[in-house]
C-alpha cells in the first residue's frame, strides 16, 4: 500500500488487527524499513498489552481506536525525511504467529495552487476546506482539497481521516 | 557495561532435556528482543530461536521446531531456553544475545551443549 | 533458507584492503536492507561490526565497511591490521535469520 501526504501535513499508516476478545490487546510495534524477522527496525512507536509504551517522538501516535484494535499511525508535520516503508508488527502470542504490514509514505513537496476565482454567488461543488480535531498533538489539521489534473496522483478514491473512533471519508470525483 | 552470562550446558544422552539459561544485566532487558544462537564445534553459527519484547511472540529454526521453546521471565532480566529430545547434532556452544529486529549487537560468551551417549 | 554464500578465505598484508562477499537470494540479501556481519576469534564470542547492511555499531573501527550491490552483500576491511585476523559471518534477516558459512580472514606477514 502506498500513501502520498504532503510535507507539513500529518500522514496516517492505517493499520488493524481484530481482538480475540474485547479488551484482550496485542503488542504491536511500528518501524521505519520493512518488516525483518522479528521486532521492527528503527522502531517509532511500541504498544503492549495496555498502552502505548515507547515512541521516540510526540510526532507520533495512534490515531484510531487502539483498543479496539486500530493501530494506525500517525505521523506529525511531515518532512521528505519521513518518507519510506513502514512496518506495522502485530505480536499475536504464539510461535511465528505474527501479522505484518509494509505500508509506503511518499511525501511530496508542498505544492502552492492559486485558489480558483468564483463567480460571485457561487458555491463550490463540494467543501475546499476540512478541519478536524486530532488526537495527536493539540494543534488542529487541516485538509486541502485539490481541484487539477494532479489529483490522479491521488491513489485511493476515499482517504480516511480516523478520529477516536469517528470516521470521515472525503471522496475524491475525478474531473479531466 | 551489557553482560549476558549463559548457564546450564553439560552432557546429556540422546532424547534427554536440558535448560539454558541467561542473565542479562547492563540495559533494560524488557526492552528488546533477545535470541539463542549456537555453534557446533569447528562449524559456523546458526541461529536457533528468538523471544519478543513482550514474550508473547517466539520464534524458532526449523531444526528444532517442537523440541526446543524460549521463554524470558522479565522481572528477573533472564532468558531461557529448554530443550527436549536432544540429538547429536545439537551439540554446540549455545550463545545468548540481544537481538534487536535480528541483529546481535551483544552476545553471552555461551555454555558448552555436549549430546551423547 | 539455505546459508548464505561466503569464500572460505581471504588473505591480505597489513595496510591492504580485503573485501568479502556474502551472497544470498531476492528473498534475503537481495531484497532488504537487512544484513549483518560478524568477527569471531578462536574460541570467543561472535562481535557485531555491521548491521542493516552498512551501520557501524559505536567502537567498530571505521576501517569496517559494508555494502550491497544485487543479492551480493560485503563486507571491506581497509588498511588490514593484525587484530583483524579473525572467522567473519555474514547474515540475512529479513524472514529468517540466516548465516553465511564463514570466512576466515589471514593477515600475511
Known amino acids: 500500500e502506498e500513501y502520498i501526504v504532503e510535507v507539513g501535513q500529518n500522514a496516517y499508516l492505517p493499520c488493524f488487527y481484530t481482538l480475540d476478545t474485547p479488551g484482550n490487546l496485542v503488542p504491536v510495534c511500528w518501524g521505519k524499513g520493512a518488516c525483518p524477522v522479528f521486532e521492527c527496525g528503527d522502531v517509532v512507536l511500541r504498544t503492549d498489552e495496555r498502552d502505548v509504551s515507547y515512541r521516540t517522538s510526540s510526532r507520533y501516535w495512534l490515531n484510531g481506536d487502539f483498543h479496539k484494535g486500530n493501530v494506525t499511525l500517525a505521523i506529525g508535520n511531515v518532512t521528505l525525511e519521513d518518507s519510506g516503508i513502514y512496518c506495522c508488527r502485530v505480536q499475536i502470542p504464539g510461535i511465528m504467529n505474527d501479522k505484518k504490514f509494509n505500508l509506503k509514505l511518499v511525501i511530496k513537496p508542498a505544492k502552492v495552487t492559486p485558489a480558483p476565482t468564483l463567480p460571485r454567488d457561487s458555491t463550490p461543488a463540494f467543501p475546499r476546506m476540512l478541519t478536524t480535531e486530532d488526537h495527536g498533538p493539540a494543534e488542529t489539521q487541516t485538509l486541502e482539497i485539490l481541484h487539477d489534473k494532479n489529483l490522479t496522483q491521488l491513489s485511493t478514491l476515499a482517504n480516511e481521516l480516523q478520529d477516536a473512533g469517528t470516521t470521515i471519508r472525503i471522496h475524491h470525483h475525478h474531473h479531466h | 557495561e551489557v553482560q549476558l552470562v549463559e548457564s546450564g550446558g553439560g552432557l546429556v544422552q540422546p532424547g534427554g532435556s536440558l535448560r539454558l539459561s541467561c542473565a542479562a544485566s547492563g540495559f533494560t532487558f524488557s526492552s528488546y528482543a533477545m535470541s539463542w544462537v549456537r555453534q557446533a564445534p569447528g562449524k559456523g553459527l546458526e541461529w536457533v530461536s528468538a523471544i519478543s519484547v513482550s514474550g508473547g511472540s517466539t520464534y524458532y529454526a526449523d531444526s528444532v521446531k517442537g523440541r526446543f521453546t524460549i521463554s524470558r521471565d522479565n522481572s528477573k532480566n533472564t532468558l531461557y531456553l529448554q530443550m527436549n529430545s536432544l540429538r547429536a547434532e545439537d551439540t554446540a556452544v549455545y550463545y545468548c544475545?540481544?537481538?534487536?529486529?535480528?541483529?546481535?549487537?551483544?552476545w553471552g560468551q555461551g555454555t558448552l551443549v555436549t549430546v551423547s551417549s | 533458507q539455505s546459508a548464505l554464500t561466503q569464500p572460505r578465505s581471504v588473505s591480505g598484508s597489513p595496510g591492504q584492503s580485503v573485501t568479502i562477499s556474502c551472497t544470498g537470494t531476492s528473498s534475503d540479501v537481495g531484497g532488504y536492507n537487512y544484513v549483518s556481519w560478524y568477527q569471531q576469534h578462536p574460541g570467543k564470542a561472535p562481535k557485531l561490526m555491521i548491521y542493516d547492511v552498512s551501520k557501524r555499531p559505536s567502537g567498530v573501527p571505521d576501517r569496517f565497511s559494508g555494502s550491497k550491490s544485487g543479492n551480493t552483500a560485503s563486507l571491506t576491511i581497509s588498511g588490514l591490521q593484525a587484530e583483524d585476523e579473525a572467522d567473519y559471518y555474514c547474515?540475512?534477516?529479513?524472514?529468517?535469520?540466516?548465516f553465511g558459512g564463514g570466512t576466515k580472514v589471514t593477515v600475511l606477514g
Open positions: 547474515s540475512s534477516y529479513a524472514d529468517s535469520v540466516v
Open positions: 544475545a540481544k537481538a534487536n529486529w535480528g541483529f546481535f549487537d551483544y
